[in-house]
């Protein structure tokens, strides 16, 4: 998708994105909050498909690790925080039951504010 | 996941999240930029599974439709922008080929800044 930096834009929070395989991931949290094992491969009509995910998180090496960029510091404390979304994955639960479940993965880095009360 | 508002936090950009079915979605853009049809159901070992997605976008009715919250307006113009990520979905391309492809879906609302040139 189009790169904001090309349009002379900056993000309030710096993020990094990467492809993560199920082998790297190993486990994940499902919608009920339980830990499940993410299976490495998914059976499809023509054999098996490697299971992997596109993940985005806050850049721990970025400028914004100390707080968000462009914030009005008179009024606000700020923090860049990785947020999660749900994607479907073939998983196995603690009782060895295999099934398609929605799991949480990192999908974004957003800025959260807390008001400065009296300085 | 834990609600920032409960911790006395505010988001720089207001977002809304919803579950979107393939029937609602109908089409999507794949990684090569082509438009594909999103199939309503996915065959699994025990029959068929309805295909749906967890999507997050900027709230068009929110306070931040005019710009991001908490920004230093002396130096920055700001805009809340919906960003996308990739998830795997069973799709059909323009040549009627069915397969698992990564498609773009809305996953977040982030703030982008452009520097103010003189006030």
């Amino acid at each position: 998708h189009s790169d904001p930096a090309r349009r002379g834009e900056l993000s309030v929070c710096d993020s990094i994105s990467e492809w993560v395989t199920a082998a790297d991931k190993k486990t994940a949290v499902d919608m009920s909050g339980g830990t499940v094992t993410v299976l490495e491969k998914v059976p499809v009509s023509k054999g098996q498909l490697k299971q992997y995910f596109y993940e985005t998180k806050c850049n721990p090496m970025g400028y914004t690790k100390e707080g968000c960029r462009g914030i009005d510091k008179r009024h606000w404390n700020s923090q860049c925080r990785t947020t999660q979304s749900y994607v479907r994955a073939l998983t196995m639960d603690s009782k060895k039951r295999i099934g398609w479940r929605f799991i949480r993965i990192d999908t974004s880095c957003v800025c959260t504010l807390t008001i400065k009360r009296g300085r | 996941h834990s609600d920032p508002a409960r911790r006395g936090e505010l988001s720089v950009c207001d977002s809304i999240s919803e579950w979107v079915t393939a029937a609602d979605k109908k089409t999507a853009v794949d990684m090569s930029g082509g438009t594909v049809t999103v199939l309503e159901k996915v065959p699994v070992s025990k029959g068929q599974l309805k295909q749906y997605f967890y999507e997050t976008k900027c709230n068009p009715m929110g306070y931040t439709k005019e710009g991001c919250r908490g920004i230093d307006k002396r130096h920055w113009n700001s805009q809340c922008r919906t960003t996308q990520s990739y998830v795997r979905a069973l799709t059909m391309d323009s040549k009627k080929r069915i397969g698992w492809r990564f498609i773009r879906i809305d996953t977040s609302c982030v703030c982008t800044l452009t520097i103010k040139r003189g006030r």
């Epitope: 009005d72 008179r74 009024h75 606000w76 008001i115 300085r119 | 005019e66 919250r69 002396r74």
Partner: antibody, heavy 118, light 108 residues
């Protein structure tokens, strides 16, 4: 020309309420923080409240906390001060002020008089 | 809370003379200090900000100096329209924003 015009003052009994308004013109209202300052008869200036440009960060003097609420409607270029549980010591001229980024007051309104008396 | 103390409370000066007004902060406010002039029945008017910078349209006879805790407003040659009450205000540590009690400059 930058202008601030207060309204809504008047005579109110102790315990009563008033809502002051301040109509702004001549500048980009939602780019600036705004505030209220009052002046009791024959006395000096006392800061009452301030609000950031977006209407989220709000600050109050101890004398106003829990009784006064500052707000703004950027679509109407208007600042408000809702005053509840008014006391005799709230009697004053209330000025609306445009705040510079660093919080000195670079533009003042003409003021509106609030009298709290039975 | 930073307490601002102005002295003297009243300053009697002849037209054409120099007037020196003092403002003291209970703790350092760096240079985050403003001066205002107020005439009877009128709102205050910003004269000086950042301790020594004249606001737009303010005549050169008004000058400010100081940093930390001690500040001075000087009117080099008093004109008839300068007889008024002058207030200082700190904006370094807030809330609250705090004003001095004022100095009344009157005709001697």
């Amino acid at each position: 020309e930058v202008q601030l015009l207060e309204s809504g003052g008047g005579l109110v009994p102790p315990g009563g309420s008033l809502r002051l308004s301040c109509a702004a013109s001549g500048f980009i209202f939602d780019d600036y923080d705004m505030g209220w300052v009052r002046q009791a008869p024959g006395k000096g200036l006392e800061w009452v409240s301030a609000i950031d440009h977006g209407g989220y960060a709000r600050y109050y003097a101890d004398s106003a906390k829990g009784r006064f609420t500052i707000s703004r409607d950027n679509s109407k270029n208007t600042l408000y001060l809702q005053m509840n549980s008014l006391r005799a010591e709230d009697t004053a001229v209330y000025y609306c002020a445009k705040l510079d980024y660093y919080y000195y007051m670079d533009v003042w309104g003409q003021g509106t008089t609030v009298t709290v008396s039975s | 809370e930073i307490v601002m103390t102005q002295s003297p409370a009243v300053l009697s000066v002849s037209p054409g003379d120099r007037a020196t007004l003092s403002c003291r902060a209970s703790q350092s406010v760096d240079i985050k200090l403003a001066w205002y002039q107020q005439k009877p029945g009128q709102p205050p008017r910003l004269l000086i900000y950042d301790a020594s910078t004249r606001a737009t349209g303010i005549p050169a006879r008004f000058s400010g100096s100081g940093s930390g805790t001690d500040f001075t407003l000087t009117i080099s040659s008093l004109q008839s329209e300068d007889f008024a009450v002058y207030y200082c205000q700190q904006y370094d540590d807030w809330p609250p924003l705090t004003f001095g009690g004022g100095t009344k400059v009157e005709i001697k």
